[in-house]
C-alpha cells in the first residue's frame, strides 16, 4: 500500500515512515500490514486467499502377478518400464474412474515379487472449508476400489484374463499426505502482533482474514460516525467532531450538541 506525497513536507515525511515503511523518494512504501501516508494505519483485511486446489497423495503398494519381473523394469527409461507404466496407469484409471478427486498415479519403484509396484495415487479437490472431509472420503474410496480390484482380478490356471492381475494379499496403503491449509493459522501469523484481534470469516466459502474494523462482517465494529482504528490493545472507535456536535462513547454513539455545552447544558442523543 502506498501514499504519494507532493510538496515541501516530503523530505520531512521520509524520515517519519512508521512500522517498517521505507521512503522511495515520493512516498512511504508500507509493509503488508500497514497503510497511510506514514504507514501509521493498520489494515482491516489481510489477503489469505486459499490455494485454488488442495492435493493429497496416497502411497500404495500392489503386487502385479500377470507380469514377470525382469531387471529392465528397474530402469525407468527402458521400453519394459514404459510399457508397464502405460498398462498400469490405464488399469488404475479404470479402477478409480468414479472418483472425481482422482488425478492419476505415479510409479515410484518396481521390485521383484511378481512385480511389486510402489506408487502414489494423486488426488485433488477445489478448495472449500470442507476439503479435509472431501479428501478423507476420497482416500477411503481409493482403498475400497483397490482392495476390490486386487481381490477380483486374479490369475486363474496361471493366466490372467484381465488387463492386469494382482496378488490379493499384496495391497497396502503406506501413507496419506494431505496439503495442509489452515486459514486461521495463516491469518494469525500474517496479522503478527495484532493476531489476537483478526479472525477468519467465510463468504461464498472463501475465507477472509479481517479485524473488527472491516465493515460488512458479523464481527464488524460499528463506530457510527466515527472511524475504527486498530491498536495493539484492539480495535477502537475514533470519534469525530462536526460543526454542531462532539461524539463520544465506545462506539461514538453519544452526541453532544456544541451550543448546549457553551450554554452549560448537556444533551445526549
Amino acid at each position: 500500500r502506498t501514499t504519494t506525497c507532493f510538496g515541501d513536507g516530503c523530505q520531512n515525511t521520509a524520515s517519519r515512515c512508521k512500522n517498517g515503511g521505507t521512503w522511495d523518494g515520493l512516498k512511504c512504501q508500507c509493509p503488508n500490514l500497514y497503510y497511510g501516508e506514514l504507514c501509521e494505519e493498520v489494515v482491516s483485511s489481510i489477503d489469505i486467499g486459499p490455494p485454488e486446489t488442495i492435493s493429497a497423495q496416497m502411497e500404495l503398494t500392489v503386487t502385479v502377478t500377470s507380469v514377470k519381473f525382469t531387471e529392465e523394469l528397474k530402469n525407468h527409461s527402458s521400453q519394459e518400464f514404459q510399457e508397464f507404466k502405460q498398462t498400469f496407469t490405464e488399469q488404475m484409471n479404470i479402477v478409480y474412474s468414479g472418483i472425481p478427486e482422482y488425478v492419476g498415479v505415479n510409479i515410484t519403484k518396481l521390485r521383484l515379487g511378481s512385480v511389486v509396484v510402489e506408487h502414489d495415487v494423486l488426488l485433488r479437490t477445489k478448495y472449500t472449508p470442507e476439503y479435509k472431509t472431501v479428501l478423507d472420503n476420497a482416500t477411503e474410496v481409493v482403498k475400497e476400489k483397490i482392495t476390490k480390484v486386487t481381490t477380483q482380478q486374479i490369475m486363474i490356471n496361471d493366466i490372467c484374463s484381465d488387463m492386469m492381475c494382482f496378488n490379493t494379499t499384496g495391497t497396502q496403503v503406506q501413507n496419506i499426505t494431505v496439503t495442509q491449509y489452515d486459514p486461521e493459522e495463516d491469518c494469525r501469523k500474517m496479522a503478527k502482533e495484532y493476531g489476537d484481534y483478526f479472525v477468519v470469516e467465510y463468504r461464498d466459502q472463501k475465507p477472509y482474514c479481517i479485524s473488527p474494523c472491516e465493515p460488512g462482517f458479523s464481527v464488524s465494529k460499528n463506530c457510527n460516525l466515527g472511524k475504527c482504528q486498530m491498536s495493539l490493545s484492539g480495535p477502537q472507535c475514533l470519534c469525530v467532531t462536526t460543526e454542531t456536535h462532539w461524539y463520544s462513547g465506545e462506539t461514538c454513539n453519544q452526541g453532544t450538541q456544541k451550543s448546549l455545552v457553551y450554554g452549560h447544558h448537556h444533551h445526549h442523543h
Epitope: 521400453q79 484381465d162 492386469m164
Partner: nanobody, 123 residues
C-alpha cells in the same frame, strides 16, 4: 518401432489344419512375450495363445490340445499350428507383442499389433 505381419490364413475344411506365421521387426522375441488373438465377426477380440521369452506358454481353454504356439528367435518369427479346426475357429487372427514377460490373454495388456490374417473354417 515394432512391426508385426501375419500370414498363412485361408479357407480350410472342418477337422483340417493351418499354420499361421508372424514376422516381427525389433527385438521383442528375446526379451518379452508374443501372442495370438482372434476376433470373430461381431465379437470381441479374445486371447488364443501366449509364449514368453522364458519359454512359458499358455492357451485359452477353447484351443487347448488343438493349437500349438512356437517361435523361432533366429528368424524373428512366431507361429500358430492349428489342428482339428472347427467352424467356431473362424476369425481374423492377430499377432501381438510386448516387451514385458506377460501372463495375460487380455488384449488390453498388449501394446503392439499386426493387421491380422483371415481364417475361415467351412465345408
Amino acid at each position: 518401432e515394432v512391426q508385426l505381419v501375419e500370414s498363412g490364413g485361408g479357407l480350410v475344411q472342418p477337422g483340417g489344419s493351418l499354420r499361421l506365421s508372424c514376422a516381427a521387426s525389433g527385438n521383442t522375441f528375446s526379451r518379452g512375450s508374443m501372442s495370438w488373438f482372434r476376433q470373430a465377426p461381431g465379437k470381441e477380440r479374445e486371447g488364443v495363445a501366449i509364449i514368453s521369452s522364458d519359454g512359458w506358454t499358455g492357451y485359452a481353454d477353447s484351443v487347448k490340445g488343438r493349437f500349438t504356439i512356437s517361435q523361432d528367435n533366429a528368424k524373428n518369427s512366431l507361429y500358430l499350428q492349428m489342428n482339428s479346426l472347427r467352424a467356431e475357429d473362424t476369425a481374423v487372427y492377430y499377432c501381438a507383442a510386448s516387451f514385458l514377460v506377460l501372463r495375460a490373454l487380455n488384449p488390453k495388456a498388449w501394446h503392439y499389433w499386426g493387421q491380422g490374417t483371415m481364417v475361415t473354417v467351412s465345408s
